[in-house]
């Protein structure tokens, strides 16, 4: 229930967040799950705990394993597990699937590639970017904050992109790399006011308490490559990132598809272990481009309102 996979490469920094979140003021203790041995908080240690974060500076293959974090609230202690795997550096340029973060899609006019997990680190711009292990050079490539923008994207821009940055911890520098695939949709066309395909406006979706559910926000923006075409979820009018509930996550990046020649973008809101409170929230699917903003609202309702007992404990 409160477990998360994390991975990294040996001799690089890896920072992992406790899957069991709480208020920032809460003390968090970390342990090696197998030995129950406490992980130190002193920064002179190679592996040390810093609040909700567990830091491997740098990581070693032998660090692989399950780590327990205990969030100490004023009432009860709440436990989470981080499943960490550290891999040996690959001798060749190939990045195996198990080291890849989620794939992102782009087009001629929408080509942002975000650097995964970077928000956990203390880094300074600019990022270094590589495609299929070659450093990106030329004015087409612009490293902006935590993402890469490619001008005039072409189909052969598809490939594996690696961001490399330096994490600084008390004056010491550690390298971090993260790789994800980028796919390109190349087509000429037109742009129009967004049309939301899903959900229908004021739709109600039946869910089971205790189960997981996904909500898809899908909109079409015209034909061919689009400039500034984005879809996102909001909860009660707030950004997902402003809503501090780890069970509710919007998938990173957006998937672009072409339906009957139309350029459509979708993003999925994943709700784990649905709770009664989630039924009280308003879920807004927002579609935005240069023509304007369209919003469709969906609410959740209980599938079996009578004598429903969750089988999830």
């Amino acid at each position: 229930k409160f477990s998360k996979q994390s991975w990294g490469l040996e001799n690089e920094a890896l920072i992992v967040r406790c899957p069991r979140q709480g208020k920032s003021s809460y003390i968090v203790d970390w342990y090696y799950s197998q030995t129950n041995k406490s992980i130190p908080t002193q920064e002179r240690n190679r592996v040390f705990a810093s609040g909700q974060l567990l830091k491997f500076l740098p990581a070693e293959v032998a660090d692989s394993g399950i780590y327990t974090c205990i969030v100490r609230s004023p009432t009860f202690n709440r436990t989470g597990y981080a499943n960490v795997t550290i891999y040996k550096k690959q001798p060749d340029c190939n990045v195996p699937d198990y080291l890849m973060y989620s794939t992102v899609s782009g087009s001629e006019k929408n080509s942002k590639i975000y650097c995964p997990t970077i928000d956990l680190y203390n880094w300074t711009a600019p990022l270094e970017w590589f495609k299929n292990c070659q450093a990106l050079q030329g004015s087409r490539y612009k490293a902006h904050k935590s993402f890469l923008v490619i001008d005039n994207v072409m189909t052969d821009d598809a490939g594996d992109y690696t961001c490399k940055f330096i994490h600084n911890e008390n004056g010491a520098n550690y390298s971090v790399t993260a790789t994800r695939s980028f796919t390109v949709k190349d087509e000429q066309g037109f742009s129009r006011f967004p049309v939301i395909r899903a959900p229908a406006h004021n739709e109600t979706k039946e869910v089971e308490i205790g189960e997981n559910t996904n909500l898809t926000c899908s909109a079409c923006f015209g034909k061919g490559a689009q400039f500034l075409a984005t879809v996102q979820w909001q909860l009660n009018g707030n950004k997902i990132t402003d809503f501090s509930e780890p069970r509710i996550q919007q998938e990173e990046g957006q998937n672009q598809s072409f339906s009957n020649g139309l350029a459509c973008v979708n993003t999925v809101l994943r709700i784990a272990d649905v709770k009664e409170e989630d039924l009280l929230l308003r879920y807004d699917c927002l579609a935005l481009n240069l023509h304007g903003l369209r919003r469709h609202t969906i609410r959740l309702s209980r599938k079996n309102p009578i004598d429903h007992q969750s089988t999830y404990c």
Partner: antibody, heavy 121, light 106 residues
Amino acid sequence: QVQLQQSGAELVRPGASVTLSCKASGYTFTDYELHWVKQTPVHGLEWIGTIDPETGDTVYNQKFKAKAILTADKSSSTAYMEFRSLTSEDSAVCYCTRAFYNDYDDGFAYWGQGTLVTVSA
Amino acid sequence: QIVMTQTPAIMSASPGEKVTMTCSVSSSVSYMHWYQQKSGTSPKRWIYDTSKLASGVPARFSGSGSGTSYSLTINNMEAEDAATYYCQQWNSSPLTFGAGTKLELK
């Protein structure tokens, strides 16, 4: 929707004990800590303590450690508070309550209707 | 235990008036919750995590503060806002409440 249904008013003699109940519905009972709060005109709102219905673990306000016992019955999704050795000082409205999202301790979002306890000879 | 001091204990305001009540804390806390209670009813969560409005709370309400000083403000007092407001800390056990500020309609 989330509901906390409390038992009815109690008139009890000094020195006696009373057990108040709080039946939870509309959510998974074992997913949330349940708290008890006492309200009097003199002392206002006072937190008595909390129980984790999943494990039965409890945390008490030291002031009420000898006064209250919190229990929970998973099978009926009901929490109980036994109030012992009652004096006139214990006359109060007692509420059961819980947070909106458990891990974030984001305030008592759901309250029972309250049970009036009157201690009188 | 953390002691919460609410001021004023009682206040009155006319419709349209700006109202501010404060909650002072004996030792620093990270967040503050506020509840509204009307006579004969259970308290309602009104503002949580210092500044977030609970569901259904009008936008004329706001909360602010840090450390040992927090406040609740109503920008344009309305008749329905007449009630008692309590602050509460969830920083350390035991959880504690303020004695309340009773807001009356002038």
